[in-house]
Interface confidence: medium
Amino acid sequence: LPAQVAFTPYAPEPGSTCRLREYYDQTAQMCCSKCSPGQHAKVFCTKTSDTVCDSCEDSTYTQLWNWVPECLSCGSRCSSDQVETQACTREQNRICTCRPGWYCALSKQEGCRLCAPLRKCRPGFGVARPGTETSDVVCKPCAPGTFSNTTSSTDICRPHQICNVVAIPGNASMDAVCTSTSPTRSMAPGAVHLPQPVSTRSQHTQPTPEPSTAPSTSFLLPMGPSPPAEGSTGD
């Protein structure tokens, strides 16, 4: 005959652990049911009664199976200049991210306290390292034989076109100009763009006893442009 299935609450065998989605209650000394995501423990279990769960209230959540006495508060509302990339629901925290073309320059565990515009490399300079969610663009001077004629946070230095006969030689901020005969080799027209940083969620640990992590919430500080850095513009 198959072994009898124990229903919560039950006393575990010595040396054994509680099953999946159960926890050991130290007071009752029993294995008891956890509450599902979106719920919390309203009444803890006893030797004779199981955990009583209740739904999270508005603006609170639990992300994992848990036995927390109260749900976690969703992070602060996103500011008007931010993008809410994940709404606050009973099962997930709100996530706010810096808007496209911006990055997080000052953060705390709760999220980003300061979003700043990505540096733009001025003509004669190209992107050496693209911006990410948490780091600014790094610009570098265009090496001989390459140029950038844009003010951009994504454009890299591109090779000069090679002419049969050069009308105007290229420099760091301008492509070579060929005479009316077509060039022998030309790069694809238009600026070469680096991809914008892909949003990634940072994580921070929830207070015990729920052994889970919750995505942090980012916050935007409205601000003016950054001061120009070498090879960059704050405009």
């Epitope: 300061l114 700043a116 409205p222």
Partner: antibody
Framework: QVQLVQSGAEVKKPGASVKVSCKAS????????IDWVRQATGQGLEWMGE????????YYNEKFKGRVTMTRNKSISTAYMELSSLRSEDTAVYYC?????????????WGQGTLVTVSS | DIVLTQSPDSLAVSLGERATINCRAS??????????MHWYQQKPGQPPKLLIY???NLESGVPDRFSGSGARTDFTLTISSLQAEDVAVYYC?????????FGQGTKVEIK
């Protein structure tokens, strides 16, 4: 309007602990930090740490680590600062203050202060 | 820790005259074009009151005779025309990084 109301004055013996409360009203308590700052008589201001009531995350000044505990009760919008192993030099006025998560990033509203006297 | 040093320690100014207080940080308190330096006023028996946030922004309800300027490590609080009610101790404070720190304070009196 934003208001922070602190608990009353305390007299403690060296080695004891003190727990000061700070009840917030007029804004969403879980949205912004509560900072704790102390000021000894005739002295300057000293930041002790802060708590984010939404998650309970705390940030302590290393000087007070191991002696200070900051907690909150969301249901009554109240933050607490407990300082243990008190010594005479902990005699000071203890302030709570609100610091917005974004925007000013400064302490824009303050409690009235709680005088803690440590004396044998 | 970032150390903030205010000068002078005390200042006596005639009514209607300009008062200037300086605050120097041991390292930059700037980040991406923002200066995380703030100024507070404290009168006897009262908690501090925020006057200026992020170096130059006037807090709501604060008279416009108060102004702030500066960047990186050097900051200034100016009272353009001192009034009797401005007698107080003024503190600078940085919130660029933990632990947040305050200057030692500057006492402003009437000459």
């Amino acid at each position: 309007q934003v208001q922070l109301v602190q608990s009353g004055a305390e007299v403690k013996k060296p080695g004891a602990s003190v727990k000061v409360s700070c009840k917030a009203s007029g804004y969403t308590f879980t949205d912004d930090y509560i900072d704790w700052v102390r000021q000894a008589t005739g002295q300057g201001l000293e930041w002790m740490g802060e708590i984010y009531p939404g998650s309970g995350n705390t940030y302590y000044n290393e000087k007070f680590k191991g002696r200070v505990t900051m907690t909150r009760n969301k249901s009554i919008s109240t933050a607490y600062m407990e300082l243990s192993s008190l010594r005479s030099e902990d005699t000071a006025v203890y302030y709570c203050a609100r610091s917005q998560v974004y925007g000013k990033i400064a302490m824009d509203h303050w409690g009235q202060g709680t005088l803690v006297t440590v004396s044998s | 820790d970032i150390v903030l040093t205010q000068s002078p320690d005390s200042l006596a100014v005639s009514l209607g005259e300009r008062a200037t207080i300086n605050c120097r940080a041991s390292e930059s308190v700037d980040n991406s074009g923002n200066s995380f330096m703030h100024w507070y006023q404290q009168k006897p028996g009262q908690p501090p009151k925020l006057l200026i946030y992020r170096a130059s922004n006037l807090e709501s309800g604060v008279p416009d005779r108060f102004s702030g300027s500066g960047a990186r490590t050097d900051f200034t609080l100016t009272i353009s025309s001192l009034q009797a009610e401005d007698v107080a101790v003024y503190y600078c404070q940085q919130s660029k990084e933990d632990p947040y720190t305050f200057g030692q304070g500057t006492k402003v009196e009437i000459k």
